[in-house]
C-alpha cells in the first residue's frame, strides 16, 4: 500500500508512517515503528504539556515571583500551566500577569474616569472634543480647553485631545 501523506486527528506523520500523538500531560520518548506504539512519559513535577503533542520536553510551570508582587492563583497540573495573580490591592500589567502595578496610568489623550481601588484598576476615558490631557496620570481628568473669548483673545491654534488651544491677540484694524 501507498505510504500515507496525511494522518488522522491526534496522529502525526513520521518516516512515512502515522504515529499517535502523546496526550496532554505526557511527552514523547520515542516515535512509533511498524511494530511498536508511540512511547510517551508523564511530565515531571512542576512541568506540563497542554495539548496532544510530539514534544520531547515538557514546559516548566510559570513561576509567580513574589518580588514582582505575584502569587499563585491556580496551581499548575501536568496538563495546565500555573496561573499567577497579583497581591491584594495590586493589578496585573497584562493578561498573562507577568508583573504587578499599584495602578495603571491613563495616557495623554485620556483622562481618569475612576481612580483605582483595591479591587479595580484605573478606568480611563478618551478626552472628548473640547477637552485634553497632555500627561500620563492615575488621577487627572481631561481638562477643558482654555476659552480664548473670555480673555478677549482669539484661537491661534486649535486644541486636540492631547493639547490645549493656543490663544493670541485679536487683529486690530488700523485707523
Amino acid at each position: 500500500p501507498e505510504p500515507p501523506t496525511a494522518c488522522r486527528e491526534k496522529q502525526y506523520l513520521i518516516n512515512s508512517q502515522c504515529c499517535s500523538l502523546c496526550q496532554p500531560g505526557q511527552k514523547l520518548v520515542s516515535d512509533c515503528t511498524e511494530f511498536t506504539e508511540t512511547e510517551c512519559l508523564p511530565c515531571g513535577e512542576s512541568e506540563f504539556l497542554d495539548t496532544w503533542n510530539r514534544e520531547t520536553h515538557c514546559h516548566q510551570h510559570k513561576y509567580c515571583d513574589p518580588n514582582l508582587g505575584l502569587r499563585v492563583q491556580q496551581k499548575g497540573t501536568s496538563e495546565t500551566d500555573t496561573i499567577c495573580t497579583c497581591e491584594e490591592g495590586w493589578h496585573c500589567t497584562s493578561e498573562a500577569c507577568e508583573s504587578c502595578v499599584l495602578h495603571r496610568s491613563c495616557s495623554p489623550g485620556f483622562g481618569v474616569k475612576q481612580i483605582a481601588t483595591g479591587v479595580s484598576d484605573t478606568i480611563c476615558e478618551p478626552c472628548p472634543v473640547g477637552f485634553f490631557s497632555n500627561v500620563s496620570s492615575a488621577f487627572e481628568k481631561c481638562h477643558p480647553w482654555t476659552s480664548c473669548e473670555t480673555k478677549d483673545l482669539v484661537v491661534q491654534q486649535a486644541g486636540t485631545n492631547k493639547t490645549d488651544v493656543v490663544c493670541g491677540p485679536q487683529d486690530r484694524l488700523r485707523a
Partner: nanobody, 116 residues
Framework: EVQLLESGGGLVQPGGSLRLSCAAS???????EMWWVRQAPGKGLERVS?????????YYADSVKGRFTISRDDSKNTLYLQMNSLRAEDTAVYYC?????????WGQGTPVTVSS
C-alpha cells in the same frame, strides 16, 4: 532603578500632626506623578493622595480631605505628606509610589499610630 524610603511616622495622639517624607535614590522624581498609599492593620491598600509631575494638580481621598497636604521638593528628590488633625482611623503603614507604580519600586513604608 528608583528606591523609595519613607520616614517620619510614629505614635501621635488624636488631633496631633506628623510630616511624612519619601526620599528617592537611584533615580529622579522630577516630572513624575507621585502617590501616598496606606494600609491599615488587616485592611487593603487605600490611595490617600497624589501629586502631578508638575506639582500643579493634587488628589486627596475623601477620608483625608482638608486634613492632609501633599507636596514635593524635586531639588531634594523628596515627596512629603503633612498630616494634621489625625484620627485613630489614620493608623496604618504609609507608602509612597512613583509612576510607573511597579511592585519592585515599593518601599518599606513608615508606620503611623494614632492613639491616646
Amino acid at each position: 532603578e528608583v528606591q523609595l524610603l519613607e520616614s517620619g511616622g510614629g505614635l501621635v495622639q488624636p488631633g496631633g500632626s506628623l510630616r511624612l517624607s519619601c526620599a528617592a535614590s537611584g533615580s529622579t522624581i522630577a516630572g513624575y506623578e507621585m502617590w501616598w498609599v496606606r494600609q491599615a492593620p488587616g485592611k487593603g491598600l487605600e490611595r490617600v493622595s497624589a501629586i502631578s509631575g508638575s506639582g500643579g494638580s493634587t488628589y486627596y481621598a475623601d477620608s483625608v480631605k482638608g486634613r492632609f497636604t501633599i507636596s514635593r521638593d524635586d531639588s531634594k528628590n523628596t515627596l512629603y505628606l503633612q498630616m494634621n488633625s489625625l484620627r485613630a482611623e489614620d493608623t496604618a503603614v504609609y507608602y509612597c509610589a512613583r509612576d510607573p507604580y511597579s511592585f519592585d519600586y515599593w518601599g518599606q513604608g513608615t508606620p503611623v499610630t494614632v492613639s491616646s
